[in-house]
Amino acid sequence: VPRWRQQWSGPGTTKRFPETVLARCVKYTEIHPEMRHVDCQSVWDAFKGAFISKHPCNITEEDYQPLMKLGTQTVPCNKILLWSRIKDLAHQFTQVQRDMFTLEDTLLGYLADDLTWCGEFNTSKINYQSCPDWRKDCSNNPVSVFWKTVSRRFAEAACDVVHVMLNGSRSKIFDKNSTFGSVEVHNLQPEKVQTLEAWVIHGGREDSRDLCQDPTIKELESIISKRNIQFSCKNIYRPDKFLQCVKNPEDSSCTSEI
């Protein structure tokens, strides 16, 4: 008799999830000498232990603590780049500007990037059919709780000037309900962070509006200022030109001509 299985609204666990996590861990620790001491089998066991045999709507940050401990990593606190709804450009940027880091440039972020996972209560099975959707089912699901946990820790570690890339093509350039708006903003430490600098990325080639004047950016400025952190905002009118200048600062279009 086939066992009844809970049907959730979201996609199921990414196929070959255990193999993918393990392979990513091995690759990351090979590339990053400071993480060579990490035992990837232990990392997988801790990852698995956070959600296997647990109800996928009843996951807590506590469940992820063993994984957090194994994945502890020190990144330069003054070289952190946050992002919201513009992941690809943020990652292109840190691939060029190698001394700056997004969450996905850390071990734990790298392991989970673009993956979905969940288990089932009281069985050791991984659910490849469906997983809870944050809106339609529950917010305390394995994926959401993971990203909330690592995002909070990442923001808490930041110091000096923290940069954030925001998508100027969205109706809400700053969205209070995004991970950045609901977690990271509130976990920047005012005693360590001097300034949050927002880079608003323009989508249209001919768009020369100052999107730093957008009401949602003013809302972000207000939240940040109330937390005793300075706020700065700059438009990146041409993201292609920006990346080009970061890649090649000697380019005449990027420096002042003599």
Epitope: K79, I236, C254, T255
Partner: nanobody
């Protein structure tokens, strides 16, 4: 239009330090590069250091390890901390500004004299 106001030049002995600052004002909405060039008597103007933001910096080989450029993007102000100064650092130092994420012109300050005596 962007206006640049420089300060901090002066006379210093070999091995001494100076800090230059340059504040940009006007219509500044885009991410920009600010920096310093210098021109010694009878020589061409040369790059000293430029900065986009935070860690995105570039230095002339001759000043690496001695000069540090920093920027307060909220105030659109760039600083050049010059340590272990040598007589060959004597020059007029010019602040520059250029918005890098769209086609725009470069702006130059009036220059501030730095003299290093032996």
């Amino acid at each position: 239009q962007v206006q640049l106001v420089e300060s901090g030049g002066g006379l210093v002995h070999t091995g001494g330090s100076l800090r230059l600052s340059c504040a940009a004002s006007g219509s500044i909405s885009g991410l920009n590069t600010m920096g310093w060039y210098r021109q010694a008597p009878g020589k061409q103007r040369e790059l000293v250091a430029t900065i986009i933001s935070g860690t995105m910096t570039r230095y002339a080989d001759s000043v690496k390890g001695r000069f540090t450029i920093s920027k307060d993007n909220a105030k659109n102000t760039v600083y050049l901390q010059m340590n272990s100064l040598k007589p060959e650092d004597t020059a007029v130092y010019y602040c520059t500004f250029k918005e890098i994420t769209r086609d725009s012109r470069s702006y130059w300050g009036q220059g501030t004299q730095v003299t290093v005596s032996s």
